[in-house]
């Protein structure tokens, strides 16, 4: 069946060293356990995280994300997932694309991550 993929229409903000959470869902909501779900960096198409055949495909990740991502899957049966990026770096800032693939049918949604310096302070004077 057909569906749409929905991501945040606003930038997700995270501090360097903290976690970033990038939510994504399909509409109308349906069980996505059997689907392929993933995130890649746009426009470079580097794999950030991939879930296929009911498992995270760690070997397919770009090296700079290896060991730093987690797919929150507790609500995948409702078509809702979140990518958590740990120990956020300045280089993580930019565009991401989330996709859901059901057999040959695929839809995706773009989103943006803004990374901020927790120690940056502007003198109000």
């Amino acid at each position: 069946g057909q569906f749409r993929v929905i991501g945040p229409g606003y930038p997700i903000r995270a501090l360097v060293g903290d976690e970033a959470e990038l939510p994504c869902r399909i509409s109308p909501g349906k069980n996505a356990t059997g689907m392929e779900v993933g995130w890649y960096r746009s426009p470079f198409s580097r794999v950030v995280h991939l879930y296929r055949n009911g498992k995270d495909q760690d070997a397919e990740q770009a090296p700079e994300y290896r060991g730093r991502t987690e797919l929150l899957k507790e609500t995948i049966s409702e078509g809702k997932v979140t990518l958590r990026i740990q120990n956020v770096r300045f280089s993580d800032e930019g565009g991401y694309t989330c996709f859901f693939r059901d057999h040959s049918y695929q839809e995706e949604a773009a989103m943006e991550l803004k990374v901020e310096d927790p120690f940056y302070w502007v003198n109000p004077g």
Partner: antibody, heavy 119, light 107 residues
């Protein structure tokens, strides 16, 4: 089943403070963003504040920015709203509501708690 | 901030009538719009999400349409329990604003 129960409302003088709580049950609390929405007597709904599932991101309406603080304790499945420098115009029923990641509608709401700011 | 303007602000109708409420966004919000029903003294109840998807358990007489800036909630045949206030809400970006509401009462 999903349940959201607000508490902490009451009568407070202008300039005073109050902390609202919202106890959640029946779902994986840490996976959901949470919101506070208020409704002044006889008026419409006004979104007040939101917090991400991890608590790392917070958002506020301009009308409460700098005065209200949203927080959550995922170990206690509880959402909070610390309200300082209260004004008469903050008088309202305050509802907590859940959504998924800030990208979904509010599918479950609490019953509301009344905050009255008056001298 | 995105403003939502509902029209009409109130309407009188009879049981069996077809009722249409519109919601206009001040800028495009794709399909990130929901409709809620609220009865006096109660919390709002989600009816429609993503502009046109019917929430589970909501009667099929409720339907939604639209995308971008113009949205519509339709009640195909008004029932006695449908007399209430209806709100639209956008969740495309923060702040997640609501429309001012449309009160549907008995003619």
């Amino acid at each position: 089943q999903v349940q959201l129960v607000e508490s902490g409302g009451g009568l407070v003088q202008p300039g005073g403070s109050l902390r609202l709580s919202c106890a959640a049950s029946g779902f994986a609390f840490r996976n959901y963003a949470m919101n506070w929405v208020r409704q002044a007597p006889g008026k419409g709904l006004e979104w007040v504040s939101a917090i991400s599932g991890s608590g790392g991101s917070t958002y506020y309406a301009d009308s409460v920015k700098g005065r209200f603080t949203i927080s959550r304790d995922n170990s206690k499945n509880t959402l909070y709203l610390q309200m300082n420098s209260l004004r008469a115009e903050d008088t309202a029923v305050y509802y907590c509501a859940r959504d998924y990641g800030g990208i979904s509608p509010f599918d479950y709401w609490g019953q509301g708690t009344l905050v009255t700011v008056s001298s | 901030d995105i403003q939502l303007t509902q029209s009409p602000s109130s309407l009188s109708a009879s049981v069996g009538d077809r009722v249409t409420i519109t919601c206009r966004a001040s800028q495009g919000i794709s399909s990130a719009l929901a409709w809620y029903q609220q009865k006096p003294g109660k919390a709002p109840k989600l009816l429609i999400y993503d502009a046109s998807s019917l929430e589970s358990g909501v009667p099929s007489r409720f339907s939604g349409s639209g995308s971008g800036t113009d949205f519509t909630l339709t009640i195909s045949s008004l029932q006695p329990e449908d007399f209430a206030t209806y709100y639209c809400q956008q969740f495309n970006s923060y702040p997640h604003t609501f429309g001012q509401g449309t009160k549907v009462d008995i003619k």
